[in-house]
C-alpha cells in the first residue's frame, strides 16, 4: 500500500539497473496485493485456486541460495510473460463479473509490460540471451462459467503475487553479491 513508483533512472551501473528492476517489481507486488485483496472482498475465495496454464512457482527450499543473475532474470521474464498473457486473457474473456475490476487490471497489465521492458533492457545490458519460453504457448480458452473466470482471477493474482515476492527476494539477494 505505497505510492506509485516514478520512472527509474537509466544507468550503466548494473547495481543501479538491478535496483530499478527491484523497484518496479516491488511496486507491481503492492499493486497485485491490493488487487488480490479487492478480489477477495468482492468474490470471497474458498481455499487455494490453481490454473494449469500458469507457470510453476520458481522457488523451492534451498534454491535461493544458489541463484545466479542470468537464471533469475531469464526465469522471471518467461514467467512474467506468461502472467501478462493471463492478465490480457482475463481482461478479454473474464466476463461481466470482472468488468468492475477493468481499470485495475488495465493498470496491472501496464505495470507488467513496463517491468518486462525493464528486464529486457537489463538483460541486454548484461549481454544475456533473450530466452524464449521452454514450452509451447498453450492457447487460453474461454472460462467455463462466470465462477470459472473468478477462480482463474484468484489463481492468476495469487501466483503473480508469489512470483513477484520470489523475484524481489532473489534480485535483492543477488544485489548483495554484485
Amino acid at each position: 500500500p505505497g505510492p506509485p513508483a516514478g520512472s527509474p533512472r537509466v544507468s550503466s551501473d548494473p547495481r543501479a539497473d538491478l535496483d530499478s528492476a527491484v523497484l518496479l517489481t516491488r511496486s507491481l507486488l503492492a499493486d497485485t496485493r491490493q488487487l488480490a485483496a479487492q478480489m477477495r472482498d468482492k468474490f470471497p475465495a474458498d481455499g487455494d485456486h490453481s490454473l494449469d496454464s500458469l507457470p510453476t512457482l520458481a522457488m523451492s527450499a534451498g534454491t535461493l541460495g544458489s541463484l545466479q543473475l542470468p537464471g533469475v532474470l531469464t526465469r522471471l521474464r518467461v514467467d512474467l510473460m506468461s502472467y501478462l498473457r493471463h492478465v490480457q486473457w482475463l481482461r478479454r474473456a473474464g466476463g461481466p463479473s470482472l468488468k468492475t475490476l477493468e481499470p485495475e487490471l488495465g493498470a496491472l497489465q501496464a505495470r507488467l509490460e513496463r517491468l518486462l521492458r525493464r528486464l529486457q533492457l537489463l538483460m541486454s545490458r548484461l549481454a544475456l540471451p533473450q530466452a524464449a519460453p521452454d514450452q509451447p504457448v498453450i492457447p487460453l480458452g474461454p472460462p467455463a462459467s462466470a465462477w470459472g473466470s473468478i477462480r482463474a482471477a484468484h489463481a492468476i493474482l495469487g501466483g503473480l503475487h508469489l512470483t513477484l515476492d520470489w523475484a524481489v527476494r532473489g534480485l535483492l539477494l543477488l544485489k548483495t553479491r554484485l
Epitope: 505505497g2 516514478g6 507486488l29 503492492a30 523451492s60 527450499a61 508469489l162 527476494r169 544485489k175
Partner: antibody, heavy 119, light 111 residues
Framework: EVQLVQSGAEVKKPGASVKISCKAS????????MDWVKQAPGQRLEWIGD????????IYNQKFTGRATLTVDKSASTAYMELSSLRSEDTAVYYC????????????WGQGTTVTVSS | DIVLTQSPASLALSPGERATLSCRAS??????????IHWYQQKPGQAPRLLIY???NLDSGVPARFSGSGSGTDFTLTISSLEEEDFATYYC?????????FGQGTKLEIK
Amino acid sequence: EVQLVQSGAEVKKPGASVKISCKASGYTFTDYNMDWVKQAPGQRLEWIGDINPHQGGPIYNQKFTGRATLTVDKSASTAYMELSSLRSEDTAVYYCARGELGHWYFDVWGQGTTVTVSS
Amino acid sequence: DIVLTQSPASLALSPGERATLSCRASKSVSTSGYSYIHWYQQKPGQAPRLLIYLASNLDSGVPARFSGSGSGTDFTLTISSLEEEDFATYYCQHSRDLPPTFGQGTKLEIK
C-alpha cells in the same frame, strides 16, 4: 485474532543447537513471509532471515548463513528456526514476525523465546 | 549494510507534550516514491509493535497521534500529544536492501 505463539525458553551449552517453533493462527499462513529477529541484551534488533511458507525458500542475513536454518510445516501453520554451533553471544530473545511480501516490515510478532547459552 | 542512527538516545517528556524522534540512514533508503523505513514501539518484556510502515503509513489500530515523515536519509516519528502508554523504546528499521537493519532505539521516558 491474528497471533504468533512461540515455544518456551531454552538453556543450552556452547556448541549445541536449538530449534524454536512459531505457530501462526488467525490468518492465511502462506500469504505472508515469516521472519526471525534476534534481540541480544544491550544490542540492536538483528534480522536473521525469512522464509516464504508457500514455497519454502529461505533467505538469510549473511551473518547467520550456515548457522541458522529456517523451515516451515505448512499443514501445521508453523515456522521453525534452528541455530547451531551455539556460543555465548547467541544468548538473546528470538522473535518470529509476520513479514509483508517484498517489503520486510513486520506487523505481527511472536512473544519471543529466550535462549541462554552457558557452560 | 545500511546503518540507522537514532537520536536522541533517550528523551524525557511529560504527558501531553509533543515528541519528535529522529532516524538517519547511512545511505538513501528512498527510491521513486517509496521510502523503506518503518517504526516500532517496544515496552519492557514485550515484543516490538509496528507503528508506521513505508515512512508514513499508520498500521491498523495505531492511534492517529503517531505520524511518520521524511525521505532520503532523514526520517522522523512524531507523537503529537504523549499519553502514559507511549513511554517506551522506539526503533526505526529499513528494508531498502538486504539485510534489513534496525536503529539502536530511542528510549522515551516520563519527566
